[in-house]
């Protein structure tokens, strides 16, 4: 099978505002013009799709309007940002890349990025 290598960081810590960013890089065997990127979350052996986008090489990634993901592409790199994360969203986020066109079709799946999310402490009431 034509498996494509996909690299992503092992660990990322979300910001205090619940935003996590990481780079997903793929070793393209061909001259792809259309690429599909999917972010999967694995927790407790359950895998769910977080978001997905198809983009033309050289163009921006377009996620659905209500998506928690945004991203930009540069060559064979995709910069992904996931927003609105809370502590319960901590888990392994896997980058899946598909070269959709022209044929042949290629699929690559990264090893996953463990995203840690820590809910911010509530601000204490202040007496003045």
């Amino acid at each position: 099978c034509k498996a494509m290598h996909v690299a992503q960081p092992a660990v990322v810590l979300a910001s205090s505002r619940g935003i996590a960013s990481f780079v997903c890089e793929y070793a393209s065997p061909g001259k792809a013009t259309e690429v599909r990127v999917t972010v999967l979350r694995q927790a407790d052996s359950q895998v769910t799709e977080v978001c997905a986008a198809t983009y033309m090489m050289g163009n921006e990634l377009t996620f659905l309007d209500d998506s928690i993901c945004t991203g930009t592409s540069s060559g064979n790199q995709v910069n992904l940002t996931i927003q609105g994360l809370r502590a319960m969203d901590t888990g392994l986020y896997i980058c899946k890349v598909e070269l959709m066109y022209p044929p042949p079709y290629y699929l690559g799946i990264g090893n996953g990025t463990q995203i840690y999310v820590i809910d911010p402490e509530p601000c204490p009431d202040s007496d003045f």
Partner: antibody, heavy 122, light 111 residues
Framework: EVQLLESGGGLVQPGGSLRLSCAAS????????MSWIRQAPGKGLEWVSG????????DFADSVKGRFTISRDNSKNTLYLQMNSLRAEDTAMYYC???????????????WGQGTLVTVSS | QSVLTQPPSASGTPGQRVTISCSGS????????VYWYQQLPGTAPKLLIY???NRPSGVPDRFSGSKSGTSASLAISGLRSEDEADYYC????????????FGGGTKLTVL
């Protein structure tokens, strides 16, 4: 049942136009790239054009470039081939085919329609 | 003229093993998978082999494919009369304007 059904072929004069359609059923059409392939009478298969699953990318054989356009309507599960400035050498059976994939495997053109005959003659 | 080269004809008797060759170059077969299609008389082509040697479900194991360098071959063992058809090889080509390339086809006759 996974199926492709072509229509729109017929007899047309040189210089004329035709629009072929390919109706897909039994699978998620918007997930697959598609191709048109033709076969002149008594001859072999010739790839004509291809289009990505979103419709954003297209390719054409040199023999039809500038004369044919490929498009798709994913809401109607239909693939199209607009053929302009037709020539006698475009006479052929035209097939649409799905570019299949499963898991890590590219499966080539795994589903074909029955074809529609285009005859260009005066 | 086709990008991939196949013999125009091949023949065999029932029960025999026949092989059909397909020759290409480094930009197609040399760097991509090969696919084989069977076209019975008066019908549309049907996928026979994908990814050099894989059979879709429903294709008998009498059909097998292989690839070496810039050439590929389709072997049919235990030849049957219903195998009489045209066989086409196909690959992808990174050097051409169109990504899909076919062989010229081989007419298999069962004697």
């Amino acid at each position: 049942e996974v199926q492709l059904l072509e229509s729109g072929g017929g007899l047309v004069q040189p210089g004329g136009s035709l629009r072929l359609s390919c109706a897909a059923s039994g699978f998620t059409f918007k997930a697959y790239s598609m191709s048109w392939i033709r076969q002149a009478p008594g001859k072999g298969l010739e790839w004509v054009s291809g289009i990505s699953n979103t419709g954003g990318s297209t390719d054409f054989a040199d023999s039809v470039k500038g004369r044919f356009t490929i498009s798709r309507d994913n809401s109607k599960n239909t693939l199209y081939l607009q053929m302009n400035s037709l020539r006698a050498e475009d006479t052929a059976m035209y097939y649409c085919a799905r570019l299949g994939y499963s898991g890590y495997d590219d499966r080539g053109m795994d589903v074909w329609g029955q074809g529609t005959l285009v005859t260009v003659s005066s | 003229q086709s990008v991939l080269t196949q013999p125009p004809s091949a023949s065999g008797t029932p029960g025999q093993r026949v092989t059909i060759s397909c020759s290409g170059s480094s930009s197609n077969i040399g760097s991509n998978y090969v696919y084989w299609y069977q076209q019975l008389p008066g019908t549309a082509p049907k996928l026979l082999i994908y990814g050099n040697s894989n059979r879709p479900s429903g294709v008998p194991d009498r059909f097998s494919g292989s690839k070496s360098g810039t050439s590929a071959s389709l072997a049919i063992s235990g030849l049957r009369s219903e195998d009489e058809a045209d066989y086409y090889c196909q690959s992808y080509d990174s050097s051409l304007s169109g990504p899909v390339v076919f062989g010229g086809g081989t007419k298999l006759t069962v004697l």
